[in-house]
Amino acid sequence: FSPLRRISIKILVHSLFSMLIMCTILTNCIFMTMNNPPDWTKNVEYTFTGIYTFESLVKILARGFCVGEFTFLRDPWNWLDFVVIVFAYLTEFVNLGNVSALRTFRVLRALKTISVIPGLKTIVGALIQSVKKLSDVMILTVFCLSVFALIGLQLFMGNLKHKCFRNSLENNETLESIMNTLESEEDFRKYFYYLEGSKDALLCGFSTDSGQCPEGYTCVKIGRNPDYGYTSFDTFSWAFLALFRLMTQDYWENLYQQTLRAAGKTYMIFFVVVIFLGSFYLINLILAVVAMAYEEQNQ
């Protein structure tokens, strides 16, 4: 080994070197949080870039660049360091017009903390491993969601457009003429029944066990879906989103109530099955795989 390489190895394995890098990263993160940084922070930026460059040079001199098995670029964690440095110089010395997008990559510096803190490295390693192991579970999850989305599509397509419409129209008004002239929320409230505090017209259905309209209103299928049109089973993609919402239990009781009011109480069976399979079983299966991967990584 050449003297330069021996010195580089000594620096690299020294605990103070790790401490210096860690302190630099943390200080850098603090500086990045500044809203309107003063002018002198520019010089601090250069210092940080200098330290990161020095760290990478030490690593390259100690381990080699990319030819051998344990060289600098053979370690994925070093790819991050390399990218951080490349972007630091790119944003500083190369005029690329709108650099604000490139400046975003400065945030990657915070990720350098992972490679320095051993515990964090283990957790992230486990996370990456779990993602690899999750592929089968993910395929199963997407398959199950797709199947139920298709069932939902068949059962509830268009149902969430059912609304309670005012029966006593002016003598020359028709449903179509009204829908063509409605513009504001207030116009809608004149013709459709709204519960107090609700932003959507009252849903209703045509089966005996579905929601009924109050006196003076009749159930029609018209207009858009609830929640600004985002809640529906009208296409496979919307149905899939609704099923994902059920699986993650994201305000799912509202979707459940809306659908049951529009389709009928019998369809609670569909929701029971989806919640049990999707929310209880699949979510826990995903967690189990993550836990297993973490255990493996620890060992």
Epitope: M157, G158, N159, H162, F165, N167, S168, L169, T174, L175, E176, F206, E215, G216, T218, C219, V220, K221, I222
Partner: nanobody
């Protein structure tokens, strides 16, 4: 497809009575309001009477007290009982309904449907 068919029109003496009926057919789920309109020769179509699915009624001023609208929800039919007819009542009477029905492919559609009309002639 939803169809509205009017019947009961014809020739009647002034002061006489007629009963018009309008039957809706098709895969109907719900009928909201049902209305009668009329159009005399060279005149614009005018509203006559209406009835909602909870049997609330409304009439044009010109027919109030003479005409009575009713409906049979089980048969999806609306009736217009016309008493004390006069020559000004001569017109083609049209039935209109707000219908929600199951259409091709099993999807549901709500819309306004019209009948083809039935002619009522009142002679003096």
């Amino acid at each position: 497809e939803v169809q509205l068919v009017e019947s009961g029109g014809g020739l009647v003496q002034a002061g006489g009575s007629l009963r018009l009926s309008c039957a809706a057919s098709g895969r109907i789920l719900r009928i909201g309001y049902m209305r009668w309109h009329r159009q005399g020769a060279g005149k614009q179509r005018e509203f006559v009477a209406r009835i909602t699915d909870d049997s609330a009624t409304g009439y044009a001023d010109s027919v109030k007290g003479r005409f009575t609208i009713s409906r049979d929800n089980a048969k999806n039919t609306v009736y217009l009982q016309m008493n004390n007819l006069n020559p000004e009542d001569t017109a083609v009477y049209y039935c209109e309904a707000l219908v929600t029905a199951s259409v091709r492919g099993g999807s549901i559609h709500s819309g306004t449907y019209w009948g083809r009309g039935t002619l009522v002639t009142v002679s003096s």
